[in-house]
């Protein structure tokens, strides 16, 4: 198994679970259905992963290739400032918002967008790959 927390850089392990996509040193899950932000978070945590935390502009650009106009929840919230679920601040990109009630973050092919957390959207999970596919 890849060692360390969900948020650490993963070692180069060979495989991802079914329906997960390997990109770089991580596995990504792009949902087909839609849920609110909290339910999306729970879905990821139940699969030993986390809602997508983007580390830099390069990762964001790579992931946007796989996205459409449809928004996907990511692990970003506004708690006295926009912060990722690992506690780090959003500092490499701006996020669009139209209202102070929009306190959860989403992404589409155009960039980051705030939304009311209750809105049902697709979501993206991220995790370390595992050496043994049979573990899933």
């Amino acid at each position: 198994l890849c060692q360390g927390s969900n948020y650490s850089t993963c070692a180069s392990c060979p495989s991802c679970p079914d329906r997960w996509m390997k990109y770089g040193n991580h596995c990504y899950y792009f949902s087909v259905e839609e849920k609110d932000w909290n339910s999306s978070l729970e879905f990821c945590l139940a699969r030993d992963s986390h809602l997508l935390v983007i580390t830099d502009n390069q990762e964001m650009s790579l992931l946007q290739v796989f996205l459409s106009e449809a928004f996907c929840w990511i692990g970003l919230r506004n708690n006295s400032g926009w912060r990722w679920e690992d506690g780090s601040p959003l500092n490499f990109s701006r996020i669009s918002s139209n209202s102070f009630v929009q306190t959860c973050g989403a992404i589409n092919k155009n960039g980051l967008q705030a939304s009311s957390c209750e809105v049902p959207l697709h979501w993206v999970c991220k995790k370390c790959p595992f050496a043994d596919q049979a573990l899933f």
Epitope: D36, F71, S96, S97, N98, S99, F100, V101, Q102, A106, Q113, S115, S116, E118, V119, P120, L121
Partner: antibody, heavy 118, light 108 residues
């Protein structure tokens, strides 16, 4: 497509109450805030309040808090605003509107013209 | 509450002219949360410009918005007859949501 349907007109007597409806279609009703606005003839827009149908929690403009009550019926995807103790100053068009992720209030009903007259 | 004051209340312009209307807030508004609506006579308002400078879908490129803090403006670079309407600014930075009194644009 998203639609908010409101009755065209309501006629009420001074001192009475009125319950205005806003029937939503084309989206998941419980997932978006519904706002209510008042517009007197030839005047600007006033925000009355909003309600989140998923939990029925709401916010009110203090000016209307004592006379307006916002409710929803999720089974019929309908939002309601009850207005009490009406006077001639309440003769106005009342709009419902829905918020969205990118644009703030992109969907509006056609408005209900409330006429308060003896 | 955050009071929005629009000026002028009424303005008149000839086709092709450039017009600017302003919206001043009694307390600072994040530029993300300042929006403009267009309302034509007898119709519901339509979102026109959101987050200070973003044009809503199908809004002509001759419209633009700018501003920050307590001062915002909507500009039409070359007015057309179809732009005759009342324009309202609105803030979504806190409750209660508030609208400006509107600027009515008449075309000569």
């Amino acid at each position: 497509q998203v639609q908010l349907q409101q009755p065209g007109a309501e006629f009420v007597k001074p001192g009475a109450s009125v319950k205005l409806s806003c029937k939503a279609s084309g989206y998941t009703f419980t997932s978006y805030w519904i706002h209510w606005m008042k517009q007197r003839p030839g005047q600007g827009l006033e925000w009355i309040g909003n309600i989140y149908p998923g939990r029925s929690n709401n916010n009110y403009n203090e000016k209307f808090k004592n006379r307006a009550t916002l409710t929803v019926d999720t089974s019929s995807s309908t939002a309601y605003m009850q207005f009490r103790s009406l006077t001639s100053d309440d003769s106005a068009v009342y709009y419902c509107a829905r918020d969205a992720t990118v644009e703030p209030l992109p969907y509006w009903g056609q408005g209900t013209l409330v006429t308060v007259s003896a | 509450e955050n009071v929005l004051t629009q000026s002028p209340a009424i303005m008149s312009a000839s086709p092709g002219e450039k017009v600017t209307m302003t919206c001043r807030a009694s307390s600072s508004v994040s530029s993300n949360y300042l929006h403009w609506y267009q309302q034509k006579s007898g119709a519901s308002p339509k979102i026109w410009i959101y987050s200070t400078s973003n044009l809503a879908s199908a809004v002509p490129a001759r419209f633009s918005g700018s501003g920050s803090g307590t001062s915002y403006s909507l500009t039409i670079s070359s007015v057309e007859a179809e732009d005759a309407a009342t324009y309202y600014c609105q803030q979504y930075s806190g409750y209660p949501l508030t609208f400006g009194g509107g600027t009515k644009l008449e075309i000569k």
